[in-house]
């Protein structure tokens, strides 16, 4: 057979679907690899061909589109399972071709099982809600295209094993789940089960997402430097180790990049010749506020080092702040026999 542009196995599209549920999978060629859509390709006389390799097998085989009740079918650039079975797991390939052109891509499909509380190996999307921020909603994801708009599905929402009913601050509203005022106790996994009829059969779509309640923008402040501060003086003798922590609190801000850095005499540590090391640690509160600590360390400090300016800087989407550490050379204690005696005028 003639050459075919092979885009290989697209592991970025690790598709996971639940066992015994409908699944519609679009050929990734038109979404990520080619500059034209299916309609254009079809009009130009190109044909879309599907085949697959079963899990733990090397043999590519055609997909059987003649199963009872059309369990697997193709519609335009979509491969349909009505419903999936566990042994549908494998690598699927869609190939677009005619006599002069060929392009193909493979992608992994994993059919996963869920338990009665919707626990499964499925990777869950995370939806962040602001704490005590007023009404916020989440929407049952990835259910478009499964049934026509004329069909009115029933939607049931769950938190873990439990149907969401009579909750204090969470109200199911069809495809949406409304949080009247999000609290830490609302953290967790939420599942919508969409039930719809098709050709005399009933199908279920299960979608689970993780809700994480985070700090509200109403409460967000610029970075706060807790250390260094005016109360602590780093007093060292030459030859001792100098350790200065820079501890900064950052309010949670969606998509904000939090940065902490030291300057020594106005320069980044990398740009100066001192043997300095910087270690960073990060911790998070329950609402994803962040505390970053960068410890500046000079193993054997010199008297020159003790005269330098050490400034901690922090930046977030809310602003930039800086604070200098108070560093000084320790004055040696007087030696009584010599210095003190001299002080008393001894000869």
């Amino acid at each position: 057979s003639e050459r075919c542009d092979d885009w290989g196995l697209d592991t970025m599209r690790q598709i996971q679907v639940f066992e015994d549920e409908p699944a519609r999978i679009k050929c990734p060629l038109f979404e990520h690899f080619l500059k034209f859509n299916y309609s254009t390709a079809h009009s130009a006389g190109l044909t879309l061909i599907w085949y697959w390799t079963r899990q733990d097998r090397d043999l590519e085989e055609p997909i059987n589109f003649r199963l009872p009740e059309n369990r697997i079918s193709k519609e335009k650039d979509v491969l349909w399972f009505r419903p999936t079975l566990l042994n549908d797991t494998g690598n699927y390939t869609c190939m677009l071709r005619n006599t002069t052109y060929c392009s193909k891509v493979a992608f992994p499909l994993e059919v996963v099982q869920k338990d009665s509380c919707f626990n499964s190996p499925m990777k869950l999307p995370v939806h962040k809600l602001y704490i005590e921020y007023g009404i916020q909603r989440i929407t049952c994801p990835n259910v478009d295209g499964y049934f026509p708009s004329s069909v009115k599905p029933t939607i049931t929402w769950y938190m873990g094993c439990y149907k969401i009913q009579n909750f204090n601050n969470v109200i199911p509203e069809g495809m949406n789940l409304s949080f009247l005022i999000a609290l830490i106790s609302n953290n967790g996994n939420y599942t919508c089960v969409v039930t719809y009829p098709e050709n005399g059969r009933t199908f279920h779509l299960t979608r689970t997402l993780t809700v994480k309640v985070v700090g509200s923008p109403k409460n967000a402040v610029p970075p706060v430097i807790h250390s260094p501060n005016d109360h602590v003086v780093y007093e060292k003798e030459p030859g001792e180790e100098l350790l200065i922590p820079c501890t900064v609190y950052f309010s949670f801000l969606m998509d904000s990049r939090n940065e902490v850095w030291w300057t020594i005499d106005g320069k980044k540590p990398d740009d100066i010749t001192i043997d300095v090391t910087i270690n960073e640690s990060i911790s998070h509160s329950r609402t994803e506020d962040e505390t970053r600590t960068q410890i500046l360390s000079i193993k054997k400090v010199t008297s020159e080092d003790l005269k330098r300016s050490y400034v901690c800087h922090a930046r977030s989407a809310k602003g930039e702040v800086a604070k200098a550490a108070k560093v000084k050379q320790k004055v040696p204690a007087p030696r009584y026999t010599v210095e003190l005696a001299c002080g008393f005028g001894a000869t």
């Epitope: 338990d115 009665s116 938190m159 009579n166 909750f167 204090n168």
Partner: antibody
Framework: QVQLVQSGAEVKKPGSSVKVSCKAS????????IQWVRQAPGQGLEWMGY????????DYAQKFQGRVTITADESTSTAYMELSSLRSEDTAVYYC???????????????WGQGTLVTVSS | EIVMTQSPATLSVSPGERATLSCRAS??????LAWYQQKPGQAPRLLIY???TRATGIPARFSGSGSGTEFTLTISSLQSEDFAVYYC?????????FGQGTKVEIK
């Protein structure tokens, strides 16, 4: 160590109500459900309903709808089960039980209270 | 609602012998089944969940098997403290339902 401690035995007249309490110690940080189950003398176990104290969610078995009310006071980590319009066949030991999370169905009855005997007699 | 049927109602076994208890669901409950032990005057105790997983602190002589509609609890060598009533419970569908129990008594 999580424990559930229930209120003491009650003797009630037919037509009256009873309210049984269940106090949890050592509660986990994340939401959990308290289940109520009853057992008539010499009989099996019968699920009555549940409440999720931190979220307020509850549900009752069809058989008890309209007669049972399950509530919770988060500040004292105490759940309550009130059964009204009592009849002699409500004579039973009433148990509360709970799990550690809302996500592990098999362990929703992991920890049990000691039981409360409610006797309905005229 | 799913009806759970246990058999036999009473099982007479000698200490050291094997006991096999059955539980049947009126429709498939997958592996969403638990077993409980109850001694006179005590609350039930979780033994097995997920049809075959032993709960914390439960001795290895207790084992569970089955899926769908047919389940078994096996006590490999009965000890004196194992004489009690055993209940199965399904948690596949609401309302969660219990079987009527099997009493294991000394022969």
């Amino acid at each position: 160590q999580v424990q559930l401690v229930q209120s003491g035995a009650e003797v009630k007249k037919p037509g009256s109500s009873v309210k049984v309490s269940c106090k949890a110690s050592g509660s986990p940080a994340e939401p959990y459900a308290i289940q109520w189950v009853r057992q008539a003398p010499g009989q099996g176990l019968e699920w009555m309903g549940y409440i999720i104290p931190s979220l307020g969610g509850y549900d009752y078995a069809q058989k008890f709808q309209g007669r049972v009310t399950i509530t919770a006071d988060e500040s004292t980590s105490t759940a309550y089960m009130e059964l009204s319009s009592l009849r002699s066949e409500d004579t039973a030991v009433y148990y509360c039980a709970r799990g550690q999370t809302l996500y592990d169905a098999g362990r929703q009855f992991d920890i049990w209270g000691q039981g409360t005997l409610v006797t309905v007699s005229s | 609602e799913i009806v759970m049927t246990q058999s036999p109602a009473t099982l007479s076994v000698s200490p050291g012998e094997r006991a096999t208890l059955s539980c049947r669901a009126s429709q498939s409950v997958s592996s969403n089944l638990a077993w409980y032990q109850q001694k006179p005057g005590q609350a039930p105790r979780l033994l097995i969940y997920g049809a075959s997983t032993r709960a914390t602190g439960i001795p290895a002589r207790f084992s569970g098997s089955g899926s769908g509609t047919e389940f078994t609890l096996t006590i490999s060598s009965l000890q004196s403290e194992d004489f009690a009533v055993y209940y199965c419970q399904q948690y596949n569908n609401w309302p969660w339902t219990f079987g009527q129990g099997t009493k294991v008594e000394i022969k």
